[in-house]
């Protein structure tokens, strides 16, 4: 019987050009986490195997960094990165747990912020 639950950062937003950490946490189970897959809609971003380390899909290798922990850092965000992300926990003996995060990438407001600061 699967007793675990996945806690995620839920709905998050970040600025275009910035970075964001996607985090999930599996709780309420003693099952062993063997692997975590990170996916965006139908695309594989990365895999973290407890013993074998990280696999980063080549189409994301310049913009995705492993960690922290089992999480994933997305860098140089674009508006096209807006959408659903899934952390898929493969565990033994429970099976698979899936968490969902919705990321909204907002147009950068650097210019707006910049106008508020004046160099004397």
């Amino acid at each position: 019987m699967m007793t675990g639950t996945i806690e995620t950062t839920g709905n998050i937003s970040a600025e275009k050009g910035g970075s964001i950490i996607l985090q999930c946490h599996l709780s309420s189970t003693t099952a062993q986490v063997t692997q975590v897959n990170w996916e965006q809609q139908d695309q594989l971003l990365a895999i973290c195997n407890a013993d074998l380390g990280w696999h980063i899909s080549p189409s994301f290798k310049d913009r995705v960094a492993p960690g922290p922990g089992l999480g994933l850092t997305l860098q140089s965000l674009t508006v096209n990165d807006t959408g659903e992300y899934f952390c898929i926990y493969h565990t033994y003996p429970d099976g698979t747990y899936t968490g969902r995060i919705f990321l909204e990438v907002l147009e950068s407001s650097v210019a707006e912020h910049g106008a508020r600061f004046q160099i004397p």
């Epitope: 996916e39 013993d51 074998l52 696999h55 899909s57």
Partner: antibody
């Protein structure tokens, strides 16, 4: 250049154990996981498991769980695969293979070691 | 375990022919698939990774495509040195598994 050099062919009796070595050179041994893949004569490839030389952490194919043990000797940059309780169907070629960095693909392989199990 | 069903198991083609090999996964593996070439008595060599990326130094006549459960490996113009057995491999989830292989021969 990267090299993975395996130990020579072995002949073993059923029920015995065999330990195959894979001596590496030309890269940072502890930074890349090492895997073992086997192949029966004229047959396909079968992944047995992998080891992280840095941590000693292992992942095994459940088919071999309890019979296979993967270890490393960091001082000599050598990986080992020990298979116990040998049976005739373990008469295969065993390969060590290293992964690409941050990718689960085998970029370099050993030359293979034939283990023959025969009474 | 994920089964990788490769077809055909063998084929014979003429030099210059286009050769296509398919691999079907028993469940969705996204693009976590590689293709290896193995010549008799030798270790396998990586040709294609992540379904469609050509490995360093691999000739452009080799290509791969697909995602999910259906994958294709193509040799656009078969050369005599391409005589080998080709294997697909999934690493989406352990245990990592290989297809049964396709032996390519010259007519």
């Amino acid at each position: 250049q990267v090299q993975l050099v395996q130990s020579g062919a072995e002949v073993k009796k059923p029920g015995a154990s065999v330990k195959v070595s894979c001596k590496t050179s030309g890269y940072a041994f502890t930074e890349y996981t090492m895997h073992w893949v086997r192949q029966a004569p004229g047959k396909g490839l079968e992944w047995m498991g992998g080891i992280n030389p840095n941590t000693g952490g292992t992942t095994y194919n459940q088919k071999f769980q309890g019979r296979v043990t993967l270890t490393v000797d960091k001082s000599s940059s050598t990986a080992y695969m020990e298979l116990s309780s040998l049976r005739s169907e373990d008469t295969v070629v065993y390969y060590c293979a290293k992964l690409l960095r941050l990718m689960y693909y085998f970029d370099y392989w050993g030359q293979g070691t034939l283990v023959t199990v025969s009474s | 375990d994920i089964q990788m069903t490769q077809s055909p198991s063998s084929l014979s083609a003429s030099v210059g022919d286009r050769v296509t090999i398919t691999c079907q996964a028993s469940q969705d593996v996204r693009t976590a698939v590689a293709w290896y070439q193995q010549k008799p008595g030798k270790a396998p060599k990586l040709l294609i990774y992540s379904a469609s990326y050509r490995y360093t130094g691999v000739p452009s006549r080799f290509s791969g495509s697909g995602s999910g459960t259906d994958f294709t490996f193509t040799i656009s113009s078969l050369q005599p040195e391409d005589i080998a057995t080709y294997y697909c491999h999934q690493h989406y989830i352990t245990p990592w598994t290989f297809g049964g292989g396709t032996k390519v021969e010259i007519k």
